[in-house]
C-alpha cells in the first residue's frame, strides 16, 4: 500500500485513478469501512465519518479518471488507512499525519533552550532532523532540544520528518532575542566624545521593557549604575543617570549612549542589561572603554592607556618622520628628554592601529 505523509493543519490529496479516463462510481472509506465520500450520479456525497466536513474531491478531474480525496486542516488523528473503491478494485493509502511545534514561544532569549516536539500517530517510529539557519544539524526522535540558543540560530529552521522512506518538511521561524554583538570596545583619546551603541539583532513590532548600564571603572573599587531607562513601544526614556559621568541617551532605538568626554577615570567595562516584556531573563551586552592620554611633563614624554586592553596590544611612542620609537606591551610608555617635533602615541593590535594621539614637543632652549 502507498504511504503518504501529511502535516498537521495542512491539506493533503490522496490520489486514486481508474484505468479508464471517464467518470465512474467511486468511494473513499476509512479502515473501519465507514464511507467518507463518493459519487452518486453526478454529485459528490459524504458519509457519516468525522472527516465529512473537511473532505472533498476534485470534480473537474473525475472525467479523467482521477478520484482523489482532499483532506483539509489535517489532524494527527486523521492518520489511518484510507480505501478507494473504483472499478471493482480497492486502492489502499496509508496517511500518517505529523505535527512539529516549539514547546514555548518562538521568540527566545539568547542562551535559552529551544525544544521542538513531534506529534505523531500511534505505532509510527519517525526520525527528525533539523537544520538551523546557521547550518547546524540536530537529530532526534519525539523531541529535539537545542540547549543554548545563539544569535545565529535566528531565522527559519528546516526540519525533516522521515517515516517509511518518505519525508515531510516543516519550517519553524525562531527569533533569538539578543544584541547584535556580545561585546564591543570603544577606543578614545582623552577628552573626545564617546558613543556607545547597542543595536538589537531582531525586530519586534512592539518593544517594551527596561534596562540599566552598570559600570566598573578600572580605577574604582566598586561598580555602579551609570544609567537606568525604560523602553515603551520602542521609545526610550531615561529613569536615572549618574551625576558623573553625565551620560545622554537617545530617545529611539537602537539604544545609544553618549559620554561627553573620555576621561581616564571612566575607562573600564560595563554591562547593558535589558529586560523585555513577557520574557523570562534578560539581554546583555558588554561594552569596554579604553582611554589614551599623551602628556609632556618636564623632560618626560608619557603615553598611557586605561581600560581593558589585551596583553598582546602594543603601545608605542614615535617621532613623526624619524626612526625614534619606543614600544611596549604595556599600558604606559615614556621617553626621557624627547627630541622636538610631533610625537605619535599608537595603540595597536598586530600592526593595526586602534587609537592614536599626537603631541607636539617644543624645543627647550
Amino acid at each position: 500500500k502507498k504511504v503518504v505523509l501529511g502535516k498537521k493543519g495542512d491539506t493533503v490529496e490522496l490520489t486514486c485513478n481508474a484505468s479508464q479516463k471517464k467518470n465512474t462510481q467511486f468511494h473513499w472509506k476509512n479502515s473501519n469501512q465507514i464511507k467518507i465520500l463518493g459519487i452518486q450520479g453526478l454529485f459528490l456525497t459524504k458519509g457519516p465519518s468525522k472527516l465529512s466536513d473537511r473532505a472533498d474531491s476534485r470534480k473537474s478531474l473525475w472525467d479523467q479518471g482521477c478520484f482523489s480525496m482532499i483532506i483539509k486542516n489535517l489532524k494527527i488523528e486523521d492518520s489511518d488507512t484510507y480505501i478507494c473503491e473504483v472499478e471493482n478494485k480497492k486502492e489502499e493509502v496509508e496517511l500518517l499525519v505529523f505535527g512539529l511545534t516549539a514547546n514555548s514561544d518562538t521568540h527566545l532569549l539568547e542562551g535559552q533552550s529551544l525544544t521542538l516536539t513531534l506529534e505523531s500517530p500511534p505505532g509510527s517510529s519517525p526520525s527528525v532532523k533539523c537544520r538551523s539557519p546557521g547550518g547546524k544539524n540536530i537529530q532526534g526522535g519525539r523531541t529535539i532540544s537545542v540547549p543554548q540558543l545563539e544569535r545565529q540560530d535566528s531565522g527559519t529552521w528546516t526540519c525533516t520528518v522521515s517515516q517509511d522512506q518518505k519525508t515531510v518538511e516543516f519550517k519553524i521561524d525562531i527569533v533569538v532575542l539578543a544584541f547584535q554583538k556580545a561585546s564591543s570596545t570603544v577606543y578614545k583619546k582623552e577628552g573626545e566624545q564617546v558613543e556607545f551603541s547597542f543595536p538589537l539583532a531582531f525586530t519586534l513590532e512592539k518593544l517594551t521593557g527596561s534596562g540599566e548600564l552598570w559600570w566598573q571603572a578600572e580605577r574604582a573599587s566598586s561598580s555602579k549604575s551609570w544609567i537606568t531607562f525604560d523602553l515603551k513601544n520602542k521609545e526610550v526614556s531615561v529613569k536615572r543617570v549618574t551625576q558623573d559621568p553625565k551620560l545622554q541617551m537617545g530617545k529611539k532605538l537602537p539604544l545609544h549612549l553618549t559620554l561627553p568626554q573620555a576621561l581616564p577615570q571612566y575607562a573600564g567595562s560595563g554591562n547593558l542589561t535589558l529586560a523585555l516584556e513577557a520574557k523570562t531573563g534578560k539581554l546583555h551586552q558588554e561594552v569596554n572603554l579604553v582611554v589614551m592620554r599623551a602628556t609632556q611633563f618636564q623632560e618626560n614624554l608619557t603615553c598611557e592607556v586605561w581600560g581593558p586592553t589585551s596583553p598582546k596590544l602594543t603601545l608605542s611612542l614615535k617621532l613623526e618622520n624619524k626612526g625614534a620609537t619606543v614600544s611596549k606591551q604595556a599600558k604606559a610608555v615614556w621617553v626621557l628628554n624627547p627630541e622636538a617635533g610631533m610625537w605619535q602615541c599608537l595603540l595597536s593590535d598586530s600592526g593595526q592601529v586602534l587609537l592614536e594621539s599626537n603631541i607636539k614637543v617644543v624645543p627647550t632652549w
Epitope: S225, A275, K282
Partner: antibody
Framework: EVQLVESGGGLVQPGGSLRLSCAAS????????MSWVRQAPGKGLEWVAN????????YYVDSVKGRFTISRDNAKNSLYLQMNSLRAEDTAVYYC????????????WGQGTLVTVSS | DIQMTQSPSSVSASVGDRVTITCRAS??????LTWYQQKPGKAPKFLIY???SLQSGVPSRFSGSGFGTDFTLTISSLQPEDFATYYC?????????FGQGTKVEIK
Amino acid sequence: EVQLVESGGGLVQPGGSLRLSCAASGFTFSSYWMSWVRQAPGKGLEWVANINQDGGEKYYVDSVKGRFTISRDNAKNSLYLQMNSLRAEDTAVYYCVREGGQWLALDYWGQGTLVTVSS
Amino acid sequence: DIQMTQSPSSVSASVGDRVTITCRASQGISSWLTWYQQKPGKAPKFLIYAASSLQSGVPSRFSGSGFGTDFTLTISSLQPEDFATYYCQQANSFPWTFGQGTKVEIK
C-alpha cells in the same frame, strides 16, 4: 566594608522635632543616592524619602511631605532626616539605606534607630 | 501611588518545601521590582533585583520572575535559615512602595 550607622532616635512628644543622622563609611558616599525607610513596630516597611548625590533632588512619601526634610553633607559622609510636627504614627525604626544596587535596589541598610512619639 | 499586594501574608512550611510568594502591582512597573528578606530584629537584606536577577552571594534556591504587574519569589527547597519575612518593593515611580510582607514560618 560598607557601613551605615544611624543615631538621633529617642522618645519625643507629639508635635515635637527630632533629627536623625546616618554616618556612612566604606564607600564613596557622594556617588550614591540615599534613602530613609521606616518600620512601625510589628508592621511592614515604608519608604520615607530619598536624595540624590548632590542633594539637588529629593522625594518624599505623601504622609511626611512638609514635615520631614532629607539632607546630606558629602564632606562629612553623612545623611540626615529632620522630623518636625511628629505624630504617634511616625513611631518606627528608621533605617538609613544606600541605593547602590543594580536596578535601583536598596543594597545596604543600617541597623536602624527607634523613634517613639508618645505623650 | 502604586500599591504592592503580597500573598499569602503568611505561609507555614517545612525544611525542603517549595515556597512561592506572589506580589502584584496596582499598575505596570516593568521590571523595577526588588525582593528583600528580613529576620526579626534585623535590617532587611537585598535578595533579587530587576524581578529575576539574583544578587551576588544569594543562594540559587531563590528565584524571581515576572514583568509588569505580576511577580513571584520562589524558594525551591526551604532551608532553616530561610524562615523570615519577605518583602517586594517597586522602584518604578515615587513614592517607592513595599508589599505588606509574607512571613515564612516553621510548620
